[in-house]
């Protein structure tokens, strides 16, 4: 099939980085600067993506691959292929329409992006709060109150036998 196709379509012989030039009797012409073709047999070259403004060039455009952008410091990527840049906030904040706002009591955000999430409810798992939550950190749940009552024995399971030939991690 490939052989038949190449006999029928001379464009299939044009490699990546070139295009099949109808103006020149369907010969393979190189993509001009600021354009690319990432696959063979293309009839046009695509214009390179420009990383401008809040976007920053992560990978330069070449004749065979598009430019890749990321975001300038203080912003982070959103969307496929970093199609948008969104402002960073501090830990303990979330981005709203009015800018960065502190997390409400009972919620936290340990990243510079995303929304504030509720603290873990330890009691749902029958556990108690070992370390209180903050705007930046979730609560740390500990053993259940019953486990901590006087006379409760702490049972430690035996360590698993080490397999021969494996060093400890």
């Amino acid at each position: 099939f490939e052989r038949t196709r190449s006999l029928q379509d001379p464009c299939s012989n044009c490699p990546a980085g070139t295009f099949c030039d109808n103006n020149r009797n369907q010969i393979c012409s190189p993509c001009p600067p600021n354009s690319f073709s990432s696959a063979g047999g293309q009839r046009t070259c695509d214009i390179c993506r420009q990383c401008k403004g809040v976007f920053r060039t992560r990978k330069e455009c070449s004749s065979t691959s598009n430019a890749e952008c990321d975001c300038t410091p203080g912003f982070h990527c959103l969307g496929a292929g970093c199609s948008m840049c969104e402002q960073d906030c501090k830990q303990g904040q979330e981005l709203t329409k009015k800018g960065c706002k502190d997390c409400c009591f009972g919620t936290f955000n340990d990243q510079k992006r995303g929304i504030c999430r509720p603290w873990t409810n330890c009691s749902l798992d029958g556990k108690s709060v070992l370390v209180n939550g903050t705007k930046e950190r979730d609560v740390v749940c500990g053993p259940s109150p019953a486990d901590l009552s006087p006379g409760a024995s702490s049972v430690t399971p035996p360590a698993p036998a080490r397999e021969p030939g494996h060093s400890p991690q």
């Epitope: 980085g17 070139t18 190189p30 993509c31 600067p33 600021n34 390179c48 330069e60 455009c61 070449s62 004749s63 065979t64």
Partner: antibody, heavy 116, light 112 residues
Framework: SVEESGGRLVTPGTPLTLTCTVS????????MIWVRQAPGKGLEWIGV?????YISHATWVKGRFTISKTSTTVGLEITSPTTEDTATYFC??????????????WGQGTLVTVSS | DIVMTQTPASVEAAVGGTVTIKCQAS??????LAWYQQKPGQPPKLLIY???TLASGVSSRFKGSGSGTEFTLTISDLESADAATYYC??????????????FGGGTEVVVK
């Protein structure tokens, strides 16, 4: 490595072709640039051939130079030399295959003297 | 065409001193600027690319800065081996004029 050759004394109007021979890398991966330097003067960009074969000349060239490429060489033809074309001609390799590249591997240059 | 204007044409400084060379582009070239050092009888040597990134094996005494149209090369703790001519070059391939590899006129650095 990159090595220029073909520089010599020529009379005005006699076409001359300089050759840049490369080894240790592929011209299908890197761009190559031609630059010249007249005695006691600065560097002057002549043209570039990209990894995919696209050739671009500086606008001042206006047909005075022709760049060509084979699998292991890049040619520079001075179509009708004048005395102003007396210079050392350098060939250099790009650092990568991108359009906006820079040049980090240079030949020692070849001297062209145009005189009657 | 993109025109690169380099100043000064020549500068003299003592060993241990600091030299600053400026390069101005006639249109914005983002950070697509390289700096080269050339000594007599030798080809140019890449010092800095992308306006501020030091090329491999180059001393940290060389510092590039700037973006858009204004760029600077600073050589600190000057050594006698730094005596050379320095050139800026745009590598902005895709300007409207496609004249994207133009050099500045050069700056001769004389070390006393």
């Amino acid at each position: 490595s990159v090595e220029e050759s073909g520089g010599r004394l020529v009379t005005p109007g006699t076409p001359l072709t300089l050759t840049c021979t490369v080894s240790g890398f592929s011209l299908s991966t890197y761009a190559m640039i031609w630059v010249r330097q007249a005695p006691g003067k600065g560097l002057e960009w002549i043209g570039v051939v990209y990894d995919n074969g696209y050739i671009s000349h500086a606008t001042w060239v206006k047909g005075r130079f022709t760049i060509s490429k084979t699998s292991t060489t890049v040619g520079l033809e001075i179509t009708s030399p004048t005395t102003e074309d007396t210079a050392t001609y350098f060939c250099a390799r790009s650092a990568d295959g991108s359009w906006s590249t820079y040049f980090n591997l240079w030949g020692q240059g070849t001297l062209v003297t145009v005189s009657s | 065409d993109i025109v690169m204007t380099q100043t000064p044409a020549s500068v003299e400084a003592a060993v241990g001193g600091t030299v600053t060379i400026k390069c101005q582009a006639s249109e914005s070239i983002s950070n697509y600027l390289a700096w080269y050092q050339q000594k007599p009888g030798q080809p140019p040597k890449l010092l800095i690319y992308k306006a501020s990134t030091l090329a491999s094996g180059v001393s940290s005494r060389f510092k590039g800065s700037g973006s858009g149209t204004e760029f600077t090369l600073t050589i600190s703790d000057l050594e006698s081996a730094d005596a050379a001519t320095y050139y800026c070059q745009t590598n902005y391939c895709c300007s409207s004029s496609d004249n994207g590899f133009a050099f500045g006129g050069g700056t001769e650095v004389v070390v006393k």
